[in-house]
């Protein structure tokens, strides 16, 4: 299973649920569906309040139980380490795949943390991070921000990912803006 890791803002905007949590248990495989679930302890929720309603405590995260069908495999054995998890809700359950944004909270830049806690949501409705994977690439809309990290640095963990958000400048226009300057 292969997929291009998204810009964190794209991950935030395209997810139903974005939380901070600790993985606290060994995965259990459902012997019927071949899905596995990880027990988690949620510490913060950044997106999904309305989608979840009253059931605002997520205790498990679900993923296919095999790599070939894009299952997520959690490698860290540190049960006190917090992770940012951006996933989809299916029948009220949090689902993730290899392609989901799952990262140690401590590995995120201060700007990314600011984005997840406050700023990315501002760009969700109007703006789109547009991946530039090969030259030439051009903006297809004024609301697009060209994401060139992979092209220029060969990594999704480049400057735009770690420090910028695609935010409205004026109606019909979005631009890359620094998250660093917005950190209190």
């Amino acid at each position: 299973c292969t997929c291009v890791p998204p810009h964190p803002q794209t991950a935030f905007c395209n997810s139903d649920l974005v939380i901070r949590a600790k993985f606290v248990g060994t995965p259990e495989v459902n012997q019927t569906t071949l899905y596995q679930r990880y027990e988690i302890k949620m510490t913060k929720m950044y997106k999904g309040f309305q989608a979840l309603g009253d059931a605002a405590d997520i205790r498990f995260v679900y993923t296919p139980a095999m790599e070939s069908v894009c299952g997520y495999f959690h490698r860290s054995h540190n049960r006190s380490e917090e992770f940012l998890i951006a996933g989809k809700l299916q029948d009220g359950l949090l689902h993730i795949t290899t392609c989901s944004f799952v990262a140690p909270w401590n590995s995120l830049s201060l700007a990314q943390r600011r984005g997840f806690t406050k700023t990315y949501t501002v760009g969700c409705e109007e703006c789109t991070v547009f991946p530039c994977l090969s030259i030439p690439c051009k903006l297809q809309s004024g609301t697009h921000c060209l994401w060139t990290d992979q092209l220029l640095q060969g990594s999704e963990k480049g400057f735009q990912s770690r420090h910028l958000a695609c935010l409205p400048r004026e109606p019909g226009l979005c631009t890359w803006q620094s998250l660093r300057s917005q950190i209190a």
Partner: antibody, heavy 113, light 111 residues
Framework: QVQLVESGGGLVQPGGSLRLSCAAS????????MSWVRQAPGKGLEWVSA????????YYADSVKGRFTISRDNSKNTLYLQMNSLRAEDTAVYYC??????WGQGTLVTVSS | DIALTQPASVSGSPGQSITISCTGT?????????VSWYQQHPGKAPKLMIY???NRPSGVSNRFSGSKSGNTASLTISGLQAEDEADYYC??????????FGGGTKLTVLG
């Protein structure tokens, strides 16, 4: 009691086809993923293929991918393995197994000219 | 293509205890509590002796026990008896291959 009975094995020429069946009883068949495991003469065990309870997800070992097809009929409590383009190295006893626990007695497949 | 490592052979005298190890990785033995052990007598189908690391199916003697530490699982047979002489295979759920096996261990009961 829980029982799995394989059938359909036999002698087949290289390049030929064979369809194995596994009749299940004593448990709710559709509630379990099922798999096929094989054992070549004098060798160890090798996982071949698996299928989810609904039949919606299938998985294959690299050695059989593209040649073997696993399927199931939950209304008949039966698991199948369609084996095409058979090779000499596919010669083995084929076992049907429930998820990771109960096994059948096996059926011998011999690929030889 | 053996994914789990077992000793090729072990032996013990009647009444003794023996332990068979099964070493894998974090994506199989170490990552899941789904390790099974099978006993296979010549010409017979494998018989489940231990499942989910340490659980015994009904009808299996309590002389058989299983455990796991990190990426290594173990099968211990206490009070060894002549009928325990057989091949033993470990099996684990695996994130990449669904199901992986050890190469098998031939248990010889001496005397």
């Amino acid at each position: 009691q829980v029982q799995l009975v394989e059938s359909g094995g036999g002698l087949v020429q290289p390049g030929g086809s064979l369809r194995l069946s596994c009749a299940a009883s004593g448990f709710t068949f559709s509630s379990y993923a099922m798999s096929w495991v094989r054992q070549a003469p004098g060798k160890g065990l090798e996982w071949v293929s698996a299928i989810s309870g609904s039949g919606g997800s299938t998985y294959y070992a690299d050695s059989v991918k593209g040649r073997f097809t696993i399927s199931r009929d939950n209304s008949k409590n039966t698991l199948y393995l369609q084996m095409n383009s058979l090779r000499a190295e596919d010669t083995a006893v084929y076992y049907c197994a429930r998820f990771l626990d109960i096994w059948g007695q096996g059926t011998l497949v011999t690929v030889s000219s | 293509d053996i994914a789990l490592t077992q000793p090729a052979s072990v032996s013990g005298s009647p009444g003794q205890s023996i332990t068979i190890s099964c070493t894998g990785t974090s994506s199989d033995v170490g990552g899941y509590n789904y390790v099974s052990w099978y006993q296979q007598h010549p010409g017979k189908a494998p018989k489940l002796m231990i499942y989910d690391v340490s659980n015994r199916p009904s009808g299996v003697s309590n002389r058989f026990s299983g455990s796991k530490s990190g990426n290594t699982a173990s099968l211990t047979i206490s009070g060894l008896q002549a009928e325990d002489e057989a091949d033993y295979y470990c099996q684990s759920y695996d994130f990449y291959k669904f199901n992986v096996f050890g190469g098998g261990t031939k248990l010889t009961v001496l005397g």
